[in-house]
């Protein structure tokens, strides 16, 4: 789902206040709900009728350093007999998420938010039929 | 997928540098790839064999202010005849994501990262547990 544009409001101080110096803000250390964990049903990526694989990208200057992307294994969906049914489509489910990018020059360290598109898994859909003229 | 714990490394300066004052860091204004957008297949939430609805939560002191949560509509999955197949299970696909929480007292504004669990959509799986005979 879409993250709306920041515009010029969220990270600004109220108009009556002096502007933020040097185009940066104060980010408190520590993460709220850091211990909260995804605990999805087991092995849904292989039990799904639209199964997927995971690829991990790793970047030490990003938080989280590890970003996991799903790729649908099939174009069609898997039927009860374990065969691919090409009358149905496996499609990716995407999500926009934020990560934090670390930038440093010597002892000067700053951080910036970055929007990342993550494919979280796949679902099986009835196709939209494109009639060929 | 899981966001690992920060530990005490990512947001710290190198050991040879003076510590960060007052437990806060410098966050640059602006978001990298802010214009990047999800472009999923149309209406997959209603075309899926494990369809879902969306619920929007809104909080002006959070970025993004709008967080969208999916809820699976059915316990089973929808078959080719549009009927529910109770031999299969609809299950939610979850993702940990970061949001930014704004805290202000008068003209003093600071920000903090928060981890949020988002249900992005649903997928149809072969059951592990046979509750229903």
């Amino acid at each position: 789902r879409k993250i709306p544009k920041v515009g010029h409001t969220f990270f600004q101080k109220p108009e009556s206040c002096p502007p933020v110096p040097g185009g940066s803000m104060k980010l408190d250390i520590g993460i709220i709900n850091e211990n909260q964990r995804v605990s999805m049903s087991r092995n849904i990526e292989s039990r799904s009728t639209s199964p997927w694989n995971y690829t991990v990208t790793w970047d030490p200057n990003r938080y989280p350093s590890e970003v996991v992307q799903a790729q649908c294994r099939n174009l069609g969906c898997i039927n009860a007999q374990g065969k691919e049914d090409i009358s149905m489509n496996s499609v990716p489910i995407q999500q926009e998420t934020l990560v934090v990018r670390r930038k440093h020059q010597g002892c000067s360290v700053s951080f910036q938010l970055e929007k990342v598109l993550v494919t979280v898994g796949c679902t099986c859909v009835t196709p939209v039929i494109h009639h060929v003229q | 997928r899981k966001i690992p714990k920060v530990g005490h490394t990512f947001f710290q300066k190198p050991e040879s540098c003076p510590p960060v004052p007052g437990g806060s860091m410098k966050l640059d204004i602006g978001i990298i790839n802010e214009n990047q957008r999800v472009s999923m297949s149309r209406n997959i939430e209603s075309r899926s064999t494990s369809p879902w609805n969306y619920t929007v939560t809104w909080d002006p002191n959070r970025y993004p202010s709008e967080v969208v949560q999916a809820q699976c509509r059915n316990l089973g999955c929808i078959n080719a005849q549009g009927k529910e197949d109770i031999s299969m299970n609809s299950v939610p696909i979850q993702q940990e994501t970061l949001v930014v929480r704004r805290k202000h007292q008068g003209c003093s504004v600071s920000f903090q990262l928060e981890k949020v669990l988002v249900t992005v959509g649903c997928t149809c799986v072969t059951p592990v547990i046979h509750h229903v005979q």
């Epitope: 849904i44 | 509509r73 089973g76 609809s90 299950v91 939610p92 669990l117 592990v128 547990i129």
Partner: nanobody, 123 residues
Framework: QVQLVESGGGLVQVGGSLRLSCEVS????????MGWFRQAPEKEREFVAA????????RYAHFVKGRFTISRDNAKNTVHLQMDSLKPEDTAVYYC????????????????WGQGTQVTVSS
């Protein structure tokens, strides 16, 4: 933290009826389904019935099918279990709980249960 308060249990004769209620608070927005479970003395806790929050889609264990009906009141965040044609083997403590993964939810993954409500069916 999800909070669950079950009520409506009691002592009833064979063939009688009871209506159990479960008041739920603290559920996440994305909550998917609710279930009723039961545990008889010296037995494992078992699934009884489930209902989805949105569609009202329901499922029953084979041993209660046709006798028990699960329903929900979204406005009051309450789930009910109407129990008819009760049998002695229905004697147990009945619990409700969130089913975050629908019918894929494993009972051994629950961190929290309410106090339950005792149902006793006498012959």
């Amino acid at each position: 933290q999800v909070q669950l308060v079950e009520s409506g249990g009691g002592l009833v004769q064979v063939g009688g009826s009871l209506r159990l209620s479960c008041e739920v608070s603290g559920l996440p927005v994305s909550s998917y389904a609710m279930g009723w479970f039961r545990q008889a003395p010296e037995k494992e806790r078992e699934f009884v019935a489930a209902i989805s929050w949105i569609g009202g889609d329901s499922r029953y264990a084979h041993f209660v099918k046709g006798r028990f009906t699960i329903s929900r009141d979204n406005a009051k965040n309450t789930v009910h279990l109407q129990m008819d044609s009760l049998k002695p083997e229905d004697t147990a403590v009945y619990y409700c709980n969130d089913m975050p993964y629908g019918l894929d939810t494993r009972m051994d993954e629950y961190e929290y249960w309410g106090q339950g409500t005792q149902v006793t069916v006498s012959s």
